[in-house]
């Protein structure tokens, strides 16, 4: 028995508006009905929780109202979008998946997605 496998892209470049999207896919060993997905950020030897959501299979992913994350689920795949990113938010974003119900509980952690965020250059002042 090994840890549940979680796949995510190695690298993602955020858009000029500070939005990054990636897919987190897990190989479910059973028929989970309740799944918890957490996005963690590791940078400079610090680990912080970016956002987390618990969802019932077949239902929408619901993050807290003030969360910078949104997402949708389809089978064993979660499409995650993180917004409001700035250059200082560049780092390794790790997808953690927990199969909460029914038992047995399983935990899987992806190898991380390096998200690069480049702050847009300010527009030059216009003479018009």
């Amino acid at each position: 028995c090994k840890a549940m496998h979680v796949a995510q892209p190695a690298v993602v470049l955020a858009s000029s508006r500070g939005i990054a999207s990636f897919v987190c896919e897990y190989a479910s060993p059973g028929k989970a009905t309740e799944v918890r997905v957490t996005v963690l950020r590791q940078a400079d030897s610090q680990v912080t929780e970016v956002c987390a959501a618990t969802y019932m299979m077949g239902n929408e992913l619901t993050f807290l109202d003030d969360s910078i994350c949104t997402g949708t689920s389809s089978g064993n795949q979660v499409n995650l979008t993180i917004q409001g990113l700035r250059a200082m938010d560049t780092g390794l974003y790790i997808c953690k998946v927990e199969l909460m119900y029914p038992p047995p509980y399983y935990l899987g952690i992806g190898n991380g997605t390096q998200i690069y965020v480049i702050d847009p250059e300010p527009c030059p002042d216009s003479d018009f």
């Epitope: 030897s45 680990v47 912080t48 790790i94 047995p104 509980y105 190898n111 991380g112």
Partner: nanobody, 127 residues
Framework: EVQLVESGGGLVQPGGSLRLSCAAS????????IGWFRQAPGKERETVSC??????SYADSVKGRFTISRDNAKNTVYLQMNSLRAEDTAVYYC??????????????????????WTQGTQVTVSS
């Protein structure tokens, strides 16, 4: 699936020793980091120590007093606690995390990466 069971808590006098055990069933320990954490009343759960195949890491507050080890043949991780102090009083938990290539000495014990938490065992240091 992994199932962890810990044992070894109890009441001990200041300066005394205790050994906690965390036994795994359902899986070999090999692909996992095993961590010890503790939570005192009214405080957040904090890292004590963790171990993978080749590395160990300790919280500053226990360095030199606590030793973590693993016995792969018995599928068990031990936490030897010496020179115990009143401030070590807490509920101690064992947990597991899949060992990942991006873990560093500073992050491999981070509680965010862990699951399979045990119920906890009480350690009380008092005279």
């Amino acid at each position: 699936e992994v199932q962890l069971v810990e044992s070894g808590g109890g009441l001990v006098q200041p300066g005394g020793s205790l050994r906690l055990s965390c036994a795994a069933s359902g899986s070999t320990l090999d692909p996992f980091v095993i961590g010890w954490f503790r939570q005192a009343p009214g405080k957040e759960r904090e890292t004590v120590s963790c171990i993978n195949r080749s590395r160990t890491s300790y919280a500053d507050s226990v360095k030199g007093r606590f030793t973590i080890s693993r016995d792969n043949a018995k599928n068990t991780v031990y936490l030897q606690m010496n020179s115990l102090r009143a401030e070590d009083t807490a509920v101690y938990y064992c947990a597991a995390s899949p060992d990942k290539p991006f873990y560093t000495d500073q992050t491999m014990c981070n509680k965010h990466y862990y699951g399979y938490w045990t119920q906890g065992t009480q350690v009380t240091v008092s005279s």
